[in-house]
């Protein structure tokens, strides 16, 4: 009876279990009743990092110097290239696909410390009573407007991203 499931590092095809290709190799042809799975090593600038049945290897990531990127670790047939940013610059994400001089603080956060040549911007969440409605690399959280000092009342509460909205006091009718 043909198998319905295969062991680890195997795959099911044409009612039989074939060996997967090892990392660094791609599939050329599936196994048959008489032959083993045929695999070939990935090319120079290619890789596959898992046991697989891929017919094409993945291209190594390109660390584009025009984006401020450089190679941190050269790729192998089993691993992708790892990029990093030029000295003094910071990756925009874990994948490091582009570089910024320093990060900015999103709405709801203020700048605690402006970036220097050796340290990135330090952001802090705006506490209750303060807000920031912009992305910035220098602006702190701003205090909510004090409606009372303008002889007004709060019509809409503030948040960490928005100021309070002030309005006129309700006059009592005689």
């Amino acid at each position: 009876e043909p198998p319905t499931a295969c062991r680890e590092k195997q795959y099911l095809i044409n009612s039989q279990c074939c060996s997967l290709c090892q990392p660094g190799q791609k599939l050329v042809s599936d196994c048959t009743e008489f032959t083993e799975t045929e695999c070939l090593p990935c090319g120079e600038s290619e890789f596959l990092d898992t046991w697989n049945r891929e017919t094409h290897c993945h291209q190594h990531k390109y660390c584009d110097p025009n984006l401020g990127l450089r190679v941190q670790q050269k790729g192998t047939s089993e691993t992708d290239t790892i990029c990093t940013c030029e000295e003094g610059w910071h990756c925009t994400s874990e994948a490091c696909e582009s570089c910024v001089l320093h990060r900015s603080c999103s709405p709801g956060f203020g700048v605690k410390q402006i970036a220097t040549g050796v340290s990135d911007t330090i952001c802090e969440p705006c506490p209750v009573g303060f807000f920031s409605n912009v992305s910035s690399a220098f602006e702190k959280c701003h205090p909510w407007t004090s409606c009372e000092t303008k002889d007004l009342v709060v019509q809409q509460a503030g948040t960490n991203k928005t100021d309070v909205v002030c309005g006129p006091q309700d006059r009592l009718r005689a």
Epitope: L67, G68, S98, C99, V100, S104, S136, A137, F138, E139
Partner: nanobody, 116 residues
Framework: EVQLLESGGGLVQPGGSLRLSCAAS???????EMWWVRQAPGKGLERVS?????????YYADSVKGRFTISRDNSKNTLYLQMNSLRAEDTAVYYC?????????WGQGTLVTVSS
């Protein structure tokens, strides 16, 4: 495509003044915080001054406070840096930059040399 074109640099004597300009295109200038950043020969990048999108709030590094003034004209898509009482240590290439400071969005800069 974002383009930032700095101009106004040159050779000036200590105590002199210069006004740098940065012409911006390829993005909505009035929506962005803008910065002036400089790089002295053989040194790293130093953040000099910044201005919020509306031009109502500014930041200055301690080294230039009271001497430099940042401003912007959103109708002309232009950023300015008025530099007074220039010192030898202000010698650098000056760049304007927009948030979020992508490497590939920087201009060529303008060279300011302060020397007698």
């Amino acid at each position: 495509e974002v383009q930032l074109l700095e101009s106004g640099g040159g050779l000036v004597q200590p105590g002199g003044s210069l006004r740098l300009s940065c012409a911006a295109s390829g993005f909505t200038f009035r929506d962005y915080e803008m910065w002036w950043v400089r790089q002295a020969p053989g040194k790293g990048l130093e953040r000099v001054s910044a201005i919020n999108p509306q031009g109502t709030r500014t930041y200055y590094a301690d080294s230039v406070k009271g001497r430099f003034t940042i401003s912007r004209d959103n109708s002309k898509n232009t950023l300015y840096l008025q530099m007074n009482s220039l010192r030898a240590e202000d010698t650098a290439v000056y760049y304007c930059a927009k948030l979020p400071f992508y490497f590939h969005e920087w201009g060529q800069g303008t060279l300011v040399t302060v020397s007698s």
